[in-house]
């Protein structure tokens, strides 16, 4: 199809070597004030093409999105071609930052009503770029925290070094919906609650004199509990002893519940008490079982491929560690009679 | 009076719908904004979604993300909550307030929640 006539927007992604981030495209970025116009062409193509409002984002869930190549070859289509860029919707979701994603990116309704119709469509011209502006040491983070039932802020990337005086209006959109009463380099969240966690995008215009560009940043915002004042307590084992069959493989799980922590670095382990000596048992990965916002239940066993007699005079001992302490729990194997 | 009346809540199968409304009286939806919250017994308190009636603005919580649907209508002073493939887990009472300004300021009223039970 013929993107000529594509309504054409210029946008720079300027990411941080330092950190992992996202990026995303819209295909009809819903500007404050303006819809979009696509072209319908009449039978003269003399005529003036008449103006239609594009359609609203909500009509967009079924869009297609191609790549224009810059050595001219036909557009490529987005899915078949680029597997670290996911659509979602009317989305385009960049996972991995690099120069190598810089282009023009070209999306249009895959349902085109009238063979009188030029499929609406978006161009955007795309430009990434490697941050360098060592000056601004302490930009914002991309990925956001907010603390529930308190105050917070979310604050754009790209403009977090600027004073809010002459930080440039900002547009915000969380989950691709344009949040129009929001224009400053920071969103103020007097009251965290879970409906702020999201994806968080915030838009400047930066001007030249020969053209202006879209500057755009991704947040993921997170909403968390406090961290946790408890070290992790052992759900199971519960009891200290465990009847056995001797000859017989058994398997003991060690489930610890842990509390919310930012930086989590949970410990869960086994060892064998014999006597004096003590010992680490090598054993099968931790997995999580159960995420909550508050806490996570970790398990991880021990296995046994036959229970021995020596086995009846160990103290099996699963450790567990937060930054808060430690907690344990020994069980004793004792042989099932009768 | 009281500021917000929630209703619309009752006992649904697992899958099924409901949808809650919340009158708002003494101030107008255009100058704030208002949130659905919920409340299950020995559970935090949730924000599920909020609106900005003035620009149309909507938030949801990961938890309700594409199941439930919020909207207003500021002729009758009304935000509706739309509860599509309700789970068990669902099971609270629901409350709505008025958040000052956009849905990132304060809460500032709250209603008296209307109970919503989804047996499986």
């Known amino acids: 199809f013929n993107i000529s006539g594509c309504s054409t927007k210029k946008l720079l992604w300027t990411y941080s070597t330092r950190s992992e981030e996202e990026f995303v495209l819209f295909c009809d970025l819903p500007e404050p004030q303006k819809s979009h116009f696509c072209h319908r062409n009449r039978l003269s193509p003399k005529q003036v093409p008449e103006h239609l409002p594009f359609m609203g984002s909500n009509d967009l869930s079924d869009v297609q999105w191609y790549q224009q190549p810059s050595n001219g070859d036909p557009l490529e289509d987005i899915r078949k071609s680029y597997p670290h860029i996911i659509q979602d919707k009317c989305t385009l979701h960049f996972l991995t930052p690099g120069v190598n994603n810089s282009g023009s990116y070209i999306c249009r309704p895959k349902m085109i009503k009238s063979p009188y119709d030029v499929a609406c469509c978006v161009k955007m011209i795309l430009e990434v770029k490697p941050q360098t502006n060592a000056s601004c040491e302490y930009s914002a983070s991309h990925k956001q925290d907010l603390l529930l039932g308190s105050t917070g802020s979310i604050s754009c990337p790209s403009l977090s070094c600027q004073s809010d005086a002459q930080s440039p209006a900002v547009t915000w959109y969380k989950n691709g919906k344009l949040l129009s009463v929001e224009r400053s380099n920071r969103i103020v969240v007097d009251e965290v609650y879970d409906y702020h966690q999201g994806t968080y995008v915030c838009d400047y215009t930066q001007s030249d004199t020969v053209s202006s560009w879209t500057v755009r940043a991704v947040v993921q915002v997170r909403t968390i509990v406090g961290d946790t004042k408890l070290k992790p307590d052992i759900l199971d084992p519960v009891e200290d002893t465990l009847e056995v069959e001797l000859g017989k493989p058994l398997t003991i799980s060690c489930k610890a519940r842990f509390g919310f922590e930012r930086v989590f670095n949970p410990v869960i382990k086994w060892y064998i008490k014999d006597s004096d000596l003590e010992w680490e048992v090598s054993v099968p990965e931790a997995k999580s079982i159960k995420s909550t916002l508050k806490d996570e239940i970790i398990e991880r066993n021990i296995i046994l491929e036959k229970v021995t007699q020596r086995d009846l005079r160990r103290k099996f001992v699963c450790f567990v560690q937060n930054s808060i302490g430690n907690t344990t729990q020994s069980v004793q194997l004792k042989e099932k009679r009768g | 009076d009281v500021p917000l009346q929630e209703s619309g809540g009752g006992l649904v199968q697992a899958g099924g719908s409901l949808r809650l409304s919340c009158v708002a009286s003494?101030?107008?939806?255009?100058?704030?904004?208002v949130g659905w919250f919920r409340q299950a017994p020995g559970k935090e308190r949730e924000g599920l979604s909020c609106?900005?009636?003035?620009?149309?603005?909507?938030l949801y919580a990961d938890s309700v993300k594409g199941r439930f649907t919020i909207s207003s209508d500021n002729a009758k002073n009304t935000v509706y909550l739309q509860m599509n493939s309700l789970k068990p887990e669902d099971t609270a009472v629901y409350l709505c307030a008025a958040v000052r300004g956009s849905c990132f300021g304060r809460t500032t009223h709250w209603g008296q929640g209307t109970q919503v039970t989804v047996s499986s």
């Open positions: 609106i900005s009636s003035s620009d149309g603005s909507t």
């Open positions: 003494g101030f107008a939806l255009d100058e704030i904004a």
